[in-house]
Amino acid sequence: ASTQSPSVFPLTRCCKNIPSNATSVTLGCLATGYFPEPVMVTWDTGSLNGTTMTLPATTLTLSGHYATISLLTVSGAWAKQMFTCRVAHTPSSTDWVDNKTFSVCSRDFTPPTVKILQSSCDGGGHFPPTIQLLCLVSGYTPGTINITWLEDGQVMDVDLSTASTTQEGELASTQSELTLSQKHWLSDRTYTCQVTYQGHTFEDSTKKCADSNPRGVSAYLSRPSPFDLFIRKSPTITCLVVDLAPSKGTVNLTWSRASGKPVNHSTRKEEKQRNGTLTVTSTLPVGTRDWIEGETYQCRVTHPHLPRALMRSTTKTSGPRAAPEVYAFATPEWPGSRDKRTLACLIQNFMPEDISVQWLHNEVQLPDARHSTTQPRKTKGSGFFVFSRLEVTRAEWEQKDEFICRAVHEAASPSQTVQRAVSVNPGLAGGSAQSQRAPDRVLCHSGQQQGLPRAAGGSVPHPRCHCGAGRADWPGPPELDVCVEEAEGEAPWTWTGLC
């Protein structure tokens, strides 16, 4: 058998079984399930004198492990004293020790656990005509218990003859039922099940809570998108309230301006979510000039489920400004997907973080659903960056092999936009001078930024591929490098994926 450390258990008598005039008393410590021999048992008796006796180890027949008992007999004022049994098993490890501290005798009762359960609402979340509360008094040493129901702290006149007691092994359980009319339950009173046992009081309380406990309602207020602000010139802000429990009470959203000037008419939309919660949005058109000049807009939210009114405010972001740098590139052909390509656009070092990203093909803006753009993330410096990804089809690039990634940002000049063109096959197409790049080279991340994509499929570059500085004829930002394949007999610019 392999080495096994012991399990240690205190051995005590019940207090009620020890005569009150006893001058000495014996307690013990069981070490069991250990292998191999021996264990060393020592006792800390505090200020008292005691004699110890460790019985010879016995073998546990099924496992072949050992068990032993050490007994301590103490005399004097043992009732108030705590004793520590210390078991050491050096075969487990030189410092393996288990301490158990306990008194001479165990409490002579196990106190009950009191818990109130309530009957369910119906499927629609409504309360039935009567509500049952069930008080479960469980896990106590059999004995007399007294159950009292309280309503807002006052004793209720309840027929307790329905209380039933059951015994499971050494412990007993009792349950008492209270039936309430819907009117009483909805009146928001607190109901308490109070249990008196062995001179102690135990209780649990409950009350109607569905209307009052919010699930964690959140309110958010967005700033206008740069696209709406600078291109469409019809900016809007949206107040979003989420995680509302559906109820008769309606959400009240009130718009105001810090300047006290009147606000435009807002539009409101309510939507029930799959998880049963309600989402409310209110959209307010704002003046382009008002916004740019720094007006603060406020959305005040009240609802029966909210402990207090919530206010959200928004205004133009303050602080330094920096225009975005835009870099667009295409992934080379991947085996098995000849008729599709992914275009990527890195937009970085802009401040503040508000940015709109668009893709254009044939001078037409592609729907937002076509591309996926990350949320702005902070660079190691003070700016922000985003990635945008667009999947294009062979039909599109054969029609015209030029796609434009455009960033709309307040610091971009002259017209709040910066764009880069990218081609799927740059050698074949008359690609824009804005986006020169060597054929089939790939941008690599040199560790200066977080959040850049890894190689396709999560792979890492080929062992012979290293991230080296891009050539001088390829204009790229300093934190992006070119991945060079050094394998013999292959073209010097072979794509292995993003680093």
Partner: antibody, heavy 119, light 110 residues
């Protein structure tokens, strides 16, 4: 001007009950969420309960079951009922007004009423 | 529940000193952090709301800053009447919190 005046405090035995009142003046009570905050002698501020403008209420976990907040806008009064009082409930109880526009804390406090629980 | 942890619990400073008290929330607060000043025998007084907005009648030497989970109250030049206890409060409890106040910071005369 805005005024909140608490009353109903005093010496009470453990297990007893008290009803604290808060008389509001100088503003429209129905427009404001109202809060009770307590402060044990020499200790920090402790939130007890809030009642919103709709009359719905919330309690600190430890207060649920023994504390009941209510309001009567027609009488410009907010109440706090405390049942089965314990020694640890000894504190100054403040009635406080939440700002109207929300999310901004308490802009007016009463002077407080002292509740002493002792046998 | 969002817990508010205030530090230090006390600070000794002299008139004219710059004093900063910090408050850490166990979760991000979207808006609504308030600061209060309390003098012995008086109720608290609102100093700052919405993280950084000065309440009416509060001197400009008081300022509030921070976002997310970290907040600070700064007194740029301590005046004799500023010796008091200061509390932060998470005042935006749509997420119902058990105690919305920090433990307090006592600013004492050095």
């Amino acid at each position: 001007q805005v005024q909140l005046v608490e009353s109903g405090g005093g010496l009470v035995q453990p297990g007893g009950s008290l009803r604290l009142s808060c008389a509001a003046s100088g503003f429209t009570l129905s427009n404001h969420d109202m809060t009770w905050v307590r402060q044990a002698p020499g200790k920090g501020l402790e939130y007890v309960s809030i009642i919103n403008t709709y009359g719905n209420h919330w309690y600190a976990n430890w207060a649920s079951g023994r504390f009941t907040i209510s309001r009567d806008n027609s009488k410009n009064t907010v109440y706090l009922q405390i049942d089965r009082l314990r020694a640890e409930d000894t504190a100054t109880y403040y009635c406080a007004r939440e700002t109207h526009h929300g999310s901004s804390g308490i802009d007016h406090w009463g002077q407080g009423t002292l509740v002493t629980v002792s046998s | 529940d969002i817990q508010m942890t205030q530090s230090p619990s006390s600070v000794s400073a002299s008139v004219g000193d710059r004093v900063t008290i910090t408050c850490q929330a166990s979760e991000s607060i979207y808006s609504g952090l308030a600061w209060y000043q309390q003098k012995p025998g008086q109720p608290p007084k609102l100093l700052i709301y919405d993280h950084s907005t000065l309440a009416s009648g509060v001197p400009s030497r008081f300022s509030g800053s921070g976002s997310g989970t970290e907040y600070a109250l700064t007194i740029s030049s301590l005046q004799p009447e500023d010796f008091a206890t200061y509390y932060c409060q998470h005042a935006d409890y749509a997420h119902h919190s058990d105690n919305v106040f920090g433990g307090g910071t006592k600013v004492e005369i050095k």
